[in-house]
């Protein structure tokens, strides 16, 4: 109500207000991950729930195939989840056969996508080195930071290796978005 | 303001205004815990400073006996970090004993309970495999997502084992959330 | 517009609104480290990058030096990830020749530095041991909390060892704030 | 090869309870990857989506408007089926109810469906 | 709730004829449009997901297209097992919703 006379002395708005309740959200959960093509050199996207249990897209923020599609300009705080779980990495089974250990990892990438821009943009990774000394090894990345999107921008969660994702619960391994 | 004729034509607001200093928000702090009685089959529930330090609640968001309790509905985001520490695990004792070595493991839940409803909702976990080599080991879980709470939820924050949760600061095991 | 007869019914502004795009907001990424000085018992403080790829500082949330300066007092997201790497630890190595095996560690801490009060304050801390099987290791530690800052605080990132710290990626290691 | 069985009564009296059962194999009622779901059809309304249950973290029941206050769908994991009860029946519920799996797995549709069971609601 | 439109309500055509039945979303269900057919006294059977996934044992004549609001369901040869109706149905978000029927008959 910038420059308004009957804006009160202590009113302090500096530009358009939004109601929060009106601003894009989605929080999206595991699914069981269905095989799909991806390219040699570029991790594999995973795909989500985005309306079972806690699952939700609101206020235009949609998902369709893989990718979080923002619906306005702004700043939004990303984040994502994602738990691994696998059998003793050959980092460990190289070190027994005395060879040198190399290690495994896992890693998470959150990507965005811009069509006017010909190369994914990396926004955020995690990224470990799997030695593990147990026989089954569980473990979560987790990632969150806050970006300037555009509107038609696209938000993808990719990672190292979908077969060691765990997609049992919906509250291990997860990806978010809202506008701030 | 949405169709009111005093608006300036930029004006976009579509629902009721919040000034975003009257939300909602709570941030807790580790404490020594005291031991307390949990069911068989559930992880034990820690409980939290809430004003001491840097801990705060305002804004009608109160803690009292583990919970924090949710003053009215809408998104929040939730975010926790409980940092274990402990001696050698089992895991690597049995590796050397020759016996099959099942990892041991920490975990957080935070978890959402309704009165409503009679089972409580697991919104966010972390679960690692401890399988250290070294005699003395110490390793943060961070968890933080958004999720839709309606008023008179509760939230708390459980672990696998409370003997191994590090309360000698309180920046390095928390709790927190507030209203977006 | 807390008691304006022109207010709708349902209105439901309690104290002054804030346009959220014009909100203090902050993300940084890392940059190659060059060596400074640092009080023996203090940890190293990372310089970051604010302007190229990824970073920007908006509405009067600047960085300087190391630290994010706090334009106006409010409620702050604060967050950081930074992405550790390094040879075998010395722990191993000690393990191995049958010495006691104290971990090495790898730590991150938030810090808030207050002109007026002689003692920094630790707002978030992030501490690992590092007692790795693999020769060559890396792994994330992510902070994320709100915390009640006033104007003029300034905010900083220090880490236990700044040469274990992966400069190579603007997606590994990050710092940012932003006003709630 | 998944495949669903329905049983249940063919009539109902108006005022009375629908119930029916579907049964499944190749699959679990508890899998985290599927939806259950029940689904009629009529003349007068087509094909019309009714609820579902499924699990994720917990249990899950969603269930449409128009018959909320009526409907219960509830899993059994002993007997790996699921099943529909319809309270205070009128003419308009008859129709042909099917039970249908619908698959969670970022591309999600309604494969496979029960034979189906024409429920004619008559005095 | 999303309403599902298709058009035309029934069709009749010809054996060899190419066939194209629409369906228009009241909102956009982004890719969640699937389609399916179905015989008297049976179930309906999934033909497409996805707006254009072919289903495994679906012949290639059926393909399908669209995104948003608006997919098509194309029959590029009808052959005489095709006579039958044709839904379409979404699967963004709840409740899940149907479009009324294509009934696609003999000329």
């Known amino acids: 109500l910038k420059g308004q006379e009957f804006a009160p002395s202590h009113q302090q708005v500096y530009a358009p207000l939004r109601a929060d309740g009106d601003k894009p959200r989605a929080h999206l959960t595991v699914v069981r991950q269905t095989p799909t093509q991806h390219f040699k050199n570029q991790f594999p996207a995973l795909h989500w729930e985005h309306e079972l249990g806690l699952a939700f897209t609101k206020n235009r923020m949609n998902y369709t195939n893989k990718f979080l599609l923002i619906p306005e300009s702004g700043d939004y705080f990303i984040y994502s989840q994602v738990t691994f779980r696998g059998m003793t990495s050959e980092c460990s089974e190289i070190r027994q056969a005395g060879r040198p250990n190399k290690p495994d990892s896992i890693t998470v990438v959150i990507t965005k996508v811009t069509d006017s821009y010909p190369e994914p943009t990396q926004l955020l990774m995690g990224t470990k080195s799997v030695c593990e000394v147990g026989s089954n090894w569980f473990q979560p990345i987790y990632l969150g930071a806050m970006f300037s999107l555009q509107e038609g921008d696209k938000l993808m969660v990719n990672v190292s290796d979908i077969s060691l994702v765990d997609y049992t619960k919906e509250d291990k391994t997860f990806f978010g978005a809202f506008l701030l | 303001l949405k169709g009111q004729e005093f608006a300036p034509s930029h004006q976009q607001v579509y629902a009721p205004l919040r000034a975003d200093g009257d939300k909602p928000r709570a941030h807790l702090t580790v404490v020594r815990q005291t031991p307390t009685q949990h069911f068989k089959n559930q992880f034990p529930a820690l409980h939290w400073e809430h004003e001491l330090g840097l801990a705060f609640t305002k804004n009608r968001m109160n803690y009292t006996n583990k919970f924090l309790l949710i003053p009215e509905s809408g998104d929040y985001f939730i975010y926790s970090q409980v940092t274990f520490r402990g001696m050698t695990s089992e895991c690597s004792e049995i590796r050397q004993a020759g016996r099959p070595n099942k990892p041991d493991s920490i975990t957080v839940v935070i978890t959402k309970v309704t009165d409503s409803y009679p089972e409580p909702t697991q919104l966010l976990m972390g679960t690692k495999s401890v399988c250290e080599v070294g005699s003395n080991w110490f390793q943060p879980i961070y968890l933080g997502a958004m999720f839709s709470l309606q008023e008179g939820d509760k939230l708390m924050v459980n672990v696998s084992d409370i003997s191994l949760v590090d309360y000698t600061k309180e920046d390095k095991t928390f709790f927190g959330a507030f209203l977006l | 517009l807390k008691g304006q007869e022109f207010a709708p019914s349902h209105q439901q502004v309690y104290a002054p609104l804030r346009a959220d795009g014009d909100k203090p907001r902050a993300h940084l990424t890392v940059v190659r480290q060059t060596p400074t000085q640092h009080f023996k018992n203090q940890f190293p403080a990372l310089h970051w990058e604010h302007e190229l790829g990824l970073a920007f500082t908006k509405n009067r949330m600047n960085y300087t030096n190391k630290f994010l300066l706090i334009p106006e007092s409010g409620d702050y997201f604060i967050y950081s990830q930074v992405t550790f790497r390094g040879m075998t630890s010395e722990c191993s190595e000690i393990r191995q020749a049958g010495r006691p095996n104290k971990p090495d560690s790898i730590t991150v801490v938030i810090t808030k530095v207050t002109d007026s009060y002689p003692e920094p304050t630790q707002l978030l801390m992030g501490t690992k041991s590092v007692c790795e099987v693999g020769s060559n290791w890396f792994q994330p530690i992510y902070l994320g909390a709100m915390f009640s800052l006033q104007e003029g605080d300034k905010l900083m990132v220090n880490v236990s060892d700044i040469s274990l710290v992966d400069y190579t990626k603007e997606d590994k290691t990050f710092f940012g704030a932003f006003l709630l | 090869q998944v495949q669903l069985q329905q049983s249940g009564p063919g009539l109902v009296k108006p005022s009375q309870t629908l119930s029916l059962t579907c049964a499944i194999s190749?699959?679990?009622?508890?899998?985290?990857?599927?939806?259950w779901n029940w689904i009629r059809q009529s003349p007068s309304r087509g094909l019309e989506w009714l609820g579902r249950?499924?699990?994720?973290?917990?249990?899950?029941?969603d269930y449409a408007v128009s018959v909320k206050s009526r409907i219960t769908i509830n899993p059994d994991t002993s007997k790996n089926q699921f099943s529909l009860q319809l309270n205070s029946v009128t003419p308009e519920d008859t129709a042909v109810y099917y039970c249908?799996?619908?698959?969670?797995?970022?591309?999600?549709?309604?494969?496979?469906w029960g034979q189906g069971t024409l429920v004619t609601v008559s005095s | 709730d999303i309403q599902m439109t298709q058009s035309p309500s029934s069709l009749s055509a010809s054996v060899g004829d190419r066939v194209t039945i629409t369906c228009r979303a009241s909102?956009?269900?982004?890719?969640?449009l699937n389609w399916y057919q179905q015989k008297p006294g049976k179930a309906p059977k999934l033909l497409i997901y996805?707006?254009?996934s072919l289903q495994s044992g679906i012949p290639s004549r059926f393909s399908g297209s669209g995104s948003g609001t608006d997919f098509t369901l194309t029959i590029s040869s009808l052959q005489p097992e095709d006579f039958a109706t044709y839904f379409c149905?979404?699967?963004?978000?709840?409740?899940?919703?149907f479009g009324q029927g294509t009934k696609l008959e003999i000329k």
């Open positions: 249908a799996r619908e698959v969670v797995a970022g591309p999600r549709w309604f494969d496979p």
């Open positions: 190749g699959d679990s009622v508890s899998s985290n990857s599927a939806t």
């Open positions: 249950t499924y699990y994720r973290s917990k249990l899950y029941n």
């Open positions: 909102q956009s269900v982004t890719s969640y």
């Open positions: 996805t707006a254009s």
């Open positions: 149905q979404q699967s963004y978000s709840t409740p899940r919703s």
